[in-house]
């Protein structure tokens, strides 16, 4: 069998959901000494980066300006050290948002419920879309999908305080082209946990693993600020179809 280098890690900086006309940044973490990185899009070569000097950094950032539906889709990357190529990275789905229209998100029976109550979110968009997506802030990898002509239901079942947080929905024109986000709906769950006022809520900042921390090779500092490898469990297959 042909010898290959270990596969790189591909990640979107900040978010994999990029508003149209904004810049997407994809990071490919390979190896110190890599002389070339290739970004592939839907199985075809998209861009090539040859870092200078090659031996000083363990990855590269591919900047994709002017995001649009033609650049949205599945990306992967590979790298080369000498004449030896790596295996291909996992796939990363890059989504363009702020396309066309804005849906409306509502929640039944209301935004303030008691633990154990059944809650359903409704996402409505009066344009040609049949797939809807519900995301919780700070949990953008956990996308819930539902289908409907102009409205989709997202039954949450009996909720707990873990469901507390801010939610948004999108209409999807295809797997990689989403509408503008809805206005957020904040779900407040009061419950039978002792001292619910101190129960933790989910962070509303972007997913902590959506960060590119490429490191320069500087002797003793080489091992500092390495990528958060706990994130590797989250970054791929985040919303495969």
């Amino acid at each position: 069998p042909k010898q290959t280098l270990p596969k790189p890690i591909i990640r979107a900086e900040s978010t994999y959901m990029v508003p149209k006309e904004k810049q997407a940044t994809l990071c490919c973490q390979g190896s110190y000494g890599a002389v070339e990185y290739q970004l592939h899009f839907e199985g075809s070569l998209f861009a090539v980066e040859r870092p200078k000097p090659p031996e000083r950094i363990n990855g590269v950032k591919f900047h994709i300006p002017d995001m649009n539906s033609r650049k949205a889709g599945r990306y992967s990357c590979i790298y080369r050290v000498g004449e030896l190529w790596s295996e291909r990275s996992d796939l990363l789905d890059l989504v363009v948002t702020e396309m066309y229209d804005t849906p409306t998100l509502s929640v039944h029976p209301g935004p303030e419920v008691t633990s154990g109550e059944k809650v359903t979110f409704y996402c409505r968009l009066d344009t040609a879309t049949s797939m809807f997506l519900l995301l919780k802030e700070g949990r953008s990898r956990d996308v819930q999908r539902s289908y409907g002509k102009v409205q989709a239901e997202f039954p949450m079942g009996p909720v707990t305080t873990a469901h507390r947080g801010s939610y948004r929905c999108f209409g999807s024109y295809n797997n990689y082209a989403w509408s503008f986000p809805s206005e957020p709906v904040k779900l407040l769950v009061t419950g039978d946990i002792e001292n619910t006022s101190l129960a933790p809520t989910d962070p509303t900042f972007p997913d902590s693993w959506d960060t590119c921390l490429l490191t320069r090779e500087t002797g003793l500092q080489k091992d500092l600020a390495l990528w958060d490898h706990t994130a590797q469990n989250h970054h791929h297959h985040h919303h495969h179809h």
Epitope: F41, F46, I64
Partner: nanobody, 127 residues
Amino acid sequence: QVQLVESGGGLVQAGGSLRLSCAASGRTFSRYSMGWFRQAPGKEREFVAAISSSGDVTHYADSAKGRFIISRDNAKNTVSLQVNSVNLEDTAVYYCAASLTARATTVTVHPNGYNYWGQGTQVTVSS
């Protein structure tokens, strides 16, 4: 906004050489990765060669390696494609394209990554 105008096409004999040029308008030319694509009759548009905004990095299609040389002059806002030992399969419309890149060492290859396109110049190779 970048406007691209190709020149240098025409009728060339097999075995000869030609040089295609692309003139770009605008003061931001040095921020763009530049590429050449071609489309033969009845075929899809295909990547030929590309060069990074700095000119330091080039990338060629397998079919172009060895015979094609891409270069650029950021002072003159031009990118050129030298084609040597032309053959009948090189008959096509050749397009120049510009891709905005954030890094001087990035080369864009995929047509979807290009923001601006020229109108093309016809190259016909005769035997």
